[in-house]
Interface confidence: low
């Protein structure tokens, strides 16, 4: 079953995913996708390494740690509901049916609307995580957040944000529903 | 309003280096992603960097790649392009456009304009 | 990565006529999952930074006269401004943005007849 792992709107989610490279420099090509991990490939591809480096992406979608020394964690930017699910990192090992697949489960939990403050304030914060030899770590070490920072002030200006149509169209529509072709 | 603006273009010489500003105000800065677009006289727009809102993860063009760093101040609400080992191919007008939704650019600054001659 | 390309390089329309570009490009950009084409069109004028027409291949940029509406799917694109205003010299360009790094197409000069 999956891990699963919580994030609030406007916030960002951080999915742990790591390997251990064989030498330093010598990568091995990994995918994020949306939805569980397929036989192959991963369906519903937002980011995606080669043997030297990140070759495709998104804007939303970015590895925050360094991806040279095995650490593909996904950090996904201003999450909305419509990030919630399944998500697939497979470390593609070469050799056949060698790949190394995890999925991981996001919940995305509305934010907690609080008065907007008369003075608008930004909050970073770190959370700890347990580096593993491959795969990802306890759950509730990762429960959310980027490392390093998360940035909450859209909870104060979301608001406000979402009175234009594109941008409350575009938070539901853009990101989660990417792929490469 | 939104309002972006460069500044830190001029002339350099092959081989040299500029840093690009763009100065950012009108919307939360560090909640979007932003880039860097150039365009060479008389010609089209080309990408050439990307970085994320928070700054931790930055993406450059091929054709730029290991001489342009991209970064950002969130705390300042500015933009760089940090341009070293120029060349005369680099002549442009460098623009910093804010990134929305997906990857296009919903807002543009002015642009400057980045000479390398000898 | 993706190329775009337009044509015509260049077109001359009376007042008041209508102007056609096509934009083509050399993988699909429609996500068949959300049904949405990842194409932008932007137009740029004499001297200024691009300005941002249609997203989502036919989605107006709010602001943007309707005269200006986008089609297609695909690989496959039109911008067509319905009825051309002296205004609307520029030139006209189109920019996926299903796969990075994103590509703009070569540009459209657009002028009157």
């Known amino acids: 079953s999956e891990v699963e792992y919580r994030a609030e709107v406007g916030q960002n989610a951080y999915l742990p995913c790591f390997y251990t490279p064989a030498a330093p420099g010598n990568l091995v090509p990994v995918c994020w996708g949306k939805g569980a991990c397929p036989v192959f490939e991963c369906g519903n591809v937002v980011l995606r390494t080669d043997e030297r480096d990140v070759n495709y992406w998104t804007s939303r979608y970015w590895l925050n740690g360094d991806f040279r020394k095995g650490d593909v964690s996904l950090t996904i930017e201003n999450v909305t509901l419509a990030d919630s699910g399944i998500y697939c990192c497979r470390i593609q090992i070469p050799g056949i049916m060698n790949d190394e697949k995890f999925n991981l489960k996001l919940v995305i939990k509305p934010a907690k609307v609080t008065p907007a403050p008369t003075r608008q304030r930004d909050f970073t914060a770190a959370f700890p995580r347990m580096l593993t030899t491959r795969g990802h770590g306890p759950a509730e070490t990762q429960t959310l957040g980027s490392l390093p920072d998360i940035n909450l002030t859209q909870i104060s200006t979301l608001a406000n944000e979402l009175r234009d149509s594109r941008l409350a169209n575009d938070l539901r529509d853009s990101g989660a529903t990417i792929r490469i072709g | 309003q939104v309002q972006l603006v460069e500044s830190g273009g001029g002339l350099v010489r092959p081989g040299g280096s500029l840093r690009l500003s763009c100065a950012v105000s009108?919307?939360?800065?560090?909640?979007?992603?932003m880039s860097w677009v150039r365009q060479a006289p008389g010609k089209g727009l080309e990408w050439v960097s990307g970085?994320?809102?928070?700054?931790?993860?930055?993406y450059n063009a091929d054709s730029v790649k290991g001489r342009f760093t991209i970064s950002r101040d969130n705390s300042k609400n500015t933009l760089y392009l940090q341009m070293n080992s120029l060349r005369a191919e680099d002549t442009a007008v460098y623009y910093c456009?804010?990134?929305?939704?997906?990857?296009?650019?919903?807002?543009w600054g002015q642009g400057t304009l980045v000479t390398v001659s000898s | 990565e993706i190329v775009m390309t337009q044509s015509p390089d260049s077109l001359a329309v009376s007042l008041g006529e209508r102007a056609t570009i096509n934009c083509k490009s050399s993988?699909?950009?429609?996500?068949?999952?959300?049904?949405?084409?990842?194409l932008a069109w932007y137009q740029q004028k004499s001297g200024q930074p691009p300005k941002l027409l249609i997203y989502?291949?036919?989605t107006r940029e709010s602001g943007v006269p309707d005269r200006f509406s986008g089609s297609g799917s695909g690989t496959d694109f039109t911008l067509t401004i319905s009825s051309l205003q002296a205004e609307d010299v520029a030139v006209y360009y189109c920019?996926?943005?299903?796969?990075?790094?994103?590509?703009f197409g070569q540009g459209t000069k657009v002028e009157i007849k």
């Open positions: 456009a804010k990134i929305f939704g997906s990857y296009y650019f919903d807002y």
């Open positions: 009108g919307f939360t800065f560090s909640s979007y992603a």
């Open positions: 970085i994320s809102g928070s700054g931790g993860s930055t």
């Open positions: 993988q699909s950009v429609l996500y068949s999952s959300n049904n949405k084409n990842y």
């Open positions: 989502w291949a036919s």
């Open positions: 920019q996926q943005y299903y796969s990075g790094p994103p590509t």
